[in-house]
Interface confidence: low
């Protein structure tokens, strides 16, 4: 069966609609579209002949219709007058006609709705507000949204019969509910912008902040008044009933006690016409100055004077407290407070009382503490002490006495020796004292504040210390086996014992060592080279003992018989001759070499290179000690051979006491001495 489908059925104004014929026969001659529910030539839109592909518009063609060969009708830019029925007449090739009718509806596209109100500024819990969704349009459904939710059931909300008006009752303050209305028709859905209600309220009773009374003088006072109100309240400040200013904040810089009083804030709502007030009391206190302590006696005498300490200055509304050594004042028989706590009396103050006193003042805005005060307790002088007490003193030492007496203020000191004033210093210094400095030493201590004097006496004894002894000798350079030496311990001292040490050992008596003159003189008979010492003497008495520096004797001896080395007597020709001579002697001897009686040189060593047979002969080493005046010598006969020969050893010695060599030496003496001294 032939049917017509409208795509879409509901068409928005200005859009297009497509009418489609369904179940169209196969063998078509053509078809005609009509406006309306029947075939009416006057309402023909257009026709189509399939075979010729010819489309002919009819009287009802508006220029917006398009007929297609597939039996569809497209109408563009539809208007509300296009609403209705449309009929298609299908002409088959056998000229049998078939008809079908379809329809569609055209609706306007809805505008965006908006909400109007009969009261934009309702008063809280009092006014009802009627919200109306505009504009009013036909075929439109109205809906409401509250806070983006569909309209809830509530006694506070009431809809009109057409849903276009929503009445809101009993609106609370701070109602932030969002209201929107929605319009609907078959072709569109539109929603309004949200509307919230500006609920008028207040003012409530204002609050004043901050409430941090009491205030300090010199601070600023900054009070803020706030009252819940819509519209915002206007504020008025009154101080002690007098209008000050119409601001929300009241600011008074650098307040004084005169700014104390009753501060009232009045809040006014110009919309509701209501006023509310709040009062606060402000108290301003002066910041206390730093207190200080005065005393009726800054310098009390120990265990005698009472001292009254007063906390200054005296100020109103002030609490006074006392601190003793950083502790709150505790009950004591030595401390007494006045009724107002401003005065503290201290009794029986001991010396060296280091207690420190502080007073504290308090009011509601400040706590101040004074600097500490200590009492300068006068005392003394006590009996002075003299130090050090290391009598007896040695003559020649320094006497350095110090006097000290406990005293406040510090004592002045005066020294008297055997009753005679010496000096006014704390220390008495006498350099290089003698026995004449023995005596009675008195120190007087004077306190010019208390006017008191105290003295102490000490006896000083000075003794003569033994001098350090020394050894004198009658002969510092004795000759061995010839001289006797007398060592004397100096000086001569009375009541003194003399002692001797030799080689750090106490002297042991022997036939060659003799003591005399109360052991003060030590005689060495016929000294030997082993008697060099060292020698020390000591003196001692009941006070002291002293020992001399060591003394050594320079015992001159020798020269002993010299020794020539090496001992060889025979040498090969061409060899080097290297002879060395040595003799024990003090002082060291002088060495001379003679060859075959002729003086060759004054050395200890004789060296001849590449000797020949001409070097055969008597080689004499001559030693001389000018201190002892003694000489000695030795002769070695040297033979030089051209061939190998066994070395031999032989030597002839000659001492200074006389030998065959002496004649040779005598002959050389003038030349030798001349050479020696140049």
């Amino acid at each position: 069966q032939l049917t017509i489908e409208s795509r879409p059925f509901n068409v928005a104004e200005g859009k297009e609609v497509l009418l489609l014929a369904h179940n169209v026969s196969q063998n078509l001659f053509g078809y005609i579209w009509y406006k309306g529910e029947r075939v009416d030539a006057s309402r023909r839109i257009g026709s189509c002949v399939i075979r010729t592909q010819q489309i002919t518009p009819g009287p009802a063609h508006s220029g917006r219709e398009t007929i297609d060969f597939n039996a569809s009708l497209l109408i563009q830019n539809v208007t509300q007058s296009d609403t209705g029925s449309y009929t298609i007449q299908v002409i088959k090739e056998d000229l049998v006609n078939e008809e079908a009718t379809g329809q569609f509806r055209v609706y306007p596209e809805l505008p965006k709705p908006y909400i109007t109100s009969n009261n934009s500024n309702p008063i809280e819990d009092k006014d009802a507000v009627a919200l109306t969704c505009e504009p009013e349009t036909q075929d439109t459904t109205y809906l409401w949204w509250v806070n983006n939710q569909s309209l809830p059931v509530s006694p506070r909300l009431e809809l009109s019969s057409d849903n276009r008006t929503l009445t809101v009752f009993n609106i609370p303050r701070n109602d932030t509910t969002s209201y929107k209305c929605e319009t609907q028709n078959p072709v569109s859905v539109r929603r309004s912008d949200p509307v919230t209600l500006n609920v008028l309220y207040g003012p409530d009773a204002p609050t004043i902040s901050p409430l941090n009374t009491p205030y300090r003088a010199g601070e600023y006072l900054n009070l803020t008044c706030h009252a819940a109100s819509n519209p915002t309240a206007q504020y008025f400040w009154f101080v002690n009933g007098t209008f000050q200013q119409s601001t929300q904040e009241l600011f008074i810089p650098n307040i004084t006690v005169n700014n104390s009083g009753s501060y009232m804030c009045q809040a006014h709502n110009s919309a509701t016409g209501l006023n509310r007030t709040t009062v606060t009391a402000i108290t301003v206190y002066a910041e206390l100055p730093k207190p200080y302590i005065t005393s009726n006696n800054s310098n009390p005498i120990e265990d005698k004077d009472a001292v009254t300490l007063t906390c200054e200055p005296e100020t109103q509304d002030t609490t006074y407290l006392w601190w003793v050594n950083n502790q709150r004042l505790s009950v004591s028989s030595r401390l007494e407070l006045s009724n107002d706590n401003r005065t503290l009396t201290v009794f029986n103050i001991p010396r060296n009382d280091t207690t420190f006193y502080e007073c504290e003042t308090q009011n509601p805005v400040s706590v101040r503490r004074s600097d500490p005060v200590t009492l300068n307790v006068l005392y003394g002088p006590d009996a002075p002490t003299i130090s050090p007490l290391n009598t007896p003193y040695r003559a020649g030492e320094n006497l350095n006495l110090s006097c000290h007496a406990a005293s406040n203020p510090a004592a002045q000191y005066f020294w008297f020796v055997n009753g005679t004033f010496q000096q006014s210093t704390q220390e008495l210094f006498i350099p290089n004292i003698t026995v004449n400095n023995s005596g009675s030493y008195m120190c007087q201590a004077h306190n010019s504040a208390t006017g008191l004097n105290r003295t102490t006496v000490t006896a000083i004894t000075v003794y003569v210390e033994l001098p350090k002894p020394y050894i004198s000798s009658n002969n510092s350079n004795p000759i061995e086996d010839k001289d006797a030496v007398t060592l004397t311990c100096e000086p001569v001292a009375e009541n003194t014992t003399y002692l001797w040490w030799v080689n750090n050992q106490s002297l042991s008596v022997s036939p060659r060592l003799q003591l005399s003159n109360g052991n003060r003189i030590l005689t060495l008979l016929s000294v030997t080279r082993n008697d060099t010492g060292p020698y020390e003497c000591g003196i001692q008495n009941s006070e002291s003992a002293k020992r001399s520096d060591p003394v050594t004797l320079n015992v001159t001896y020798g020269p002993d018989t010299p020794i020539i080395s090496p001992p060889d007597l025979s040498y090969r020709s061409g060899a080097n001759l290297n002879l060395s001579c040595h003799s024990d002697s003090n002082p060291s001897p002088q060495y001379s070499w003679l060859i075959n009686g002729t003086l060759r040189q004054h050395t200890q060593v004789l060296f001849i290179s590449k000797i020949t047979s001409n070097n055969n002969g008597a080689y004499a080493c001559f030693v001389s000690n000018l201190a002892t005046g003694r000489n000695n010598s030795i002769v070695k006969n040297i033979s030089v051979s051209s061939g190998d020969s066994a070395p031999g050893s032989s030597g002839l010695s000659a001492s200074g006491s006389g030998s065959g060599l002496n004649d040779i030496f005598e002959a050389q003496k003038i030349e030798w001495h001349h050479h020696h001294h140049h």
Partner: antibody, heavy 120, light 107 residues
Framework: EVQLVESGGGLVKPGGSLKLSCAAS????????MSWVRQTPEKRLEWVAF????????YYADTVKGRFTISRDNAKNTLYLQMSSLKSEDTAMFYC?????????????WGQGTLVTVSA | DIQMTQSPASLSASVGETVTITCRAS??????FAWYQQKQGKSPQLLVY???ILAEGVPSRFSGSGSGTQFSLKINSLQPEDFGTYYC?????????FGSGTKLELK
Amino acid sequence: EVQLVESGGGLVKPGGSLKLSCAASGFTFSSYDMSWVRQTPEKRLEWVAFISSYGGRTYYADTVKGRFTISRDNAKNTLYLQMSSLKSEDTAMFYCAAHYFGTSGPFAYWGQGTLVTVSA
Amino acid sequence: DIQMTQSPASLSASVGETVTITCRASENIYSYFAWYQQKQGKSPQLLVYNAKILAEGVPSRFSGSGSGTQFSLKINSLQPEDFGTYYCQHHYGIPFTFGSGTKLELK
């Protein structure tokens, strides 16, 4: 005759150092406590430092504490003042003085002074 | 510290006159008090100590008095050599402090 002779003064830059000496004669130096006293260009007298007769005790004015050191050598009969971290306000004539009575006595003998100038 | 307040700062007088200089201590110093004389280009010299004791060699026309906080120096029959600057000082312990000085000038 008592004599105190100061030496060692001169021109020094701020922050610099100087050592003053005071040679004593004519009295038993080791018996006396000694002080240094200075006189500012405005003629104000200021006590600077103190030392006891054997050097066991020393004291200083607050203005010089930590910067100046007083010492003595009794064997040489000499008093010293070592000055460091000098400031322009240290410019003065420096005198050494011997005390009666120590810390409770006056300045009995004075030297002739030595001038210290602290300037950039 | 103890402050010494000396007055007058300067004083003009003629030879033969009598003058008095005063000094006040900020606290009780008993008799720990001295006077010094300083002449132009010279070092100070001790005149009086312990408030009233004349130092060695000081002429008897000088006299010191006072105790506690008030002190004075009196010079009878001024002599030409007495002109100069006078300083007061406490010797009541460390720190020692001086007055600011009194300049005595010839009128």
